[in-house]
């Protein structure tokens, strides 16, 4: 499978809410011997690979924000912790996978990564990520609502553990 990022850039005014989205593409095994770990984190465009560094989003780590389930099941993050920080990550039956950030501030600007790990019971895993930029703007040049820019190419990584 692969991860698609429908939009590579989100430009939003301060105070607005935004939902960053990733989509799982390709065949997804729904067997009992496989589980999916999905999460979000902030990162930087590293020299070696984008999304290698996993920084917190509003003080919540990628582990705080993770969703864990089999196949294309729907799932949500723990509501109390995330919602206290104005965050919610969710996943639906169609492979869509998102994080919603409420009441954006300039500090929320940066590179965001979604990560999906397909973990199998026989000690293998397949790890894929997608990256997107969030720009939060203020002042007269800021848009009145979020403006999204489609991705021209997918920025993803595949890791298989032997």
């Amino acid at each position: 499978f692969k991860v698609a990022t429908p939009y590579s850039l989100y430009v939003c005014p301060e105070g607005q809410n935004v939902t960053l989205t990733c989509r799982l593409l390709g065949p997804v095994d729904k067997g009992h011997d496989v589980t999916f770990y999905k999460t979000w984190y902030r990162s930087s465009r590293g020299e070696v690979q984008t999304c290698s560094e996993r920084r917190p989003i509003r003080n919540l780590t990628f582990q705080d924000l993770h969703l864990h389930h089999g196949g294309h099941q729907a799932a949500n993050t723990s509501h109390d912790l995330a919602q206290r920080h104005g965050l919610e990550s969710a996943s639906d039956h169609h492979g869509n996978f998102s994080i919603t950030m409420r009441n954006l501030t300039l500090l929320d600007s940066g590179l965001y990564c979604c990560l999906v790990v397909e973990i199998r019971h026989h000690h293998s895993e397949h790890r894929v990520h997608g990256a997107m930029e969030l720009q939060v703007q203020t002042g007269k040049d800021a848009p009145s609502n979020c403006v999204v820019y489609p991705s021209s190419s997918q920025d993803s990584e595949n890791i298989t553990a032997a």
């Epitope: 589980t35 590293g46 032997a162």
Partner: antibody, heavy 120, light 107 residues
Framework: QVQLVQSGAEVKKPGSSVKVSCKAS????????ISWVRQAPGQGLEWMGG????????NYAQKFQGRVTITADESTSTAYMELSSLRSEDTAVYYC?????????????WGQGTLVTVSS | DIQMTQSPSSLSASVGDRVTITCRAS??????LNWYQQKPGKAPKLLIY???SLQSGVPSRFSGSGSGTDFTLTISSLQPEDFATYYC?????????FGQGTKVEIK
């Protein structure tokens, strides 16, 4: 904050078995791999094997295959490592450690260690 | 199994010194390389993951670099609390393997 708390020190006779426990708190237990790593006195770190609780199947280093059994109890968020046919060279501190994601990612949380002494 | 070879096995340095430890893998592991610090009687502590990413809460004087088979851990200005043993670990393949360790001692 994730914490891994291990059982206390053990003194065992050669040929016997030891079972060390590792209780996790402060995070999701089921979907994270737990590895066991040992360290003989004055020596380096040696990976013994690992398990992801939701699957229940463990993976072992060849050196310990047949002598080590790693299990996990999801209901109590506890992982166990049992080592049989003990010999004096098994005297070591045994650590449990949690992987950040999946089977092979970095070990980001560690237990405090359990000293197992094998002596006649 | 992938062999991890660290050098030097020990070194003496003074507070403020720049210290470099290297780790070589017997085959390519891309950037699946982690560094740990261990103090006597304590569990190891993760410093660097993915070869160059700093674990949360670790001081920025620690940095990692490399890919493939050759990796480096650098402490830009050694502090008193940095005297410890450092281990590299490959996270690309089972079995997971560690370097033999580098002991950083006070000169």
């Amino acid at each position: 904050q994730v914490q891994l708390v291990q059982s206390g020190a053990e003194v065992k006779k050669p040929g016997s078995s030891v079972k060390v426990s590792c209780k996790a708190s402060g995070g999701t237990f089921s979907s994270y791999a737990i590895s066991w790593v040992r360290q003989a006195p004055g020596q380096g770190l040696e990976w013994m094997g690992g398990i992801i609780p939701i699957f229940g199947t463990a993976n072992y280093a060849q050196k310990f295959q047949g002598r080590v059994t790693i299990t996990a109890d999801e209901s109590t968020s506890t992982a166990y490592m049992e080592l049989s046919s003990l010999r004096s060279e098994d005297t070591a501190v045994y650590y449990c450690a949690r992987h950040s994601i999946g089977w092979v990612a970095e070990l980001d949380y560690w237990g405090q260690g359990t000293l197992v002494t094998v002596s006649s | 199994d992938i062999q991890m070879t660290q050098s030097p096995s020990s070194l003496s340095a003074s507070v403020g010194d720049r210290v470099t430890i290297t780790c070589r893998a017997s085959q390519s592991i891309a950037t699946s390389l982690n560094w740990y610090q261990q103090k006597p009687g304590k569990a190891p502590k993760l410093l660097i993951y993915y070869a160059s990413s700093l674990q949360s809460g670790v001081p920025s004087r620690f940095s990692g670099s490399g890919s493939g088979t050759d990796f480096t851990l650098t402490i830009s200005s050694l502090q008193p609390e940095d005297f410890a043993t450092y281990y590299c670990q490959q996270g690309a393949y089972y079995p997971l393997t560690f370097g033999q360790g580098t002991k950083v001692e006070i000169k």
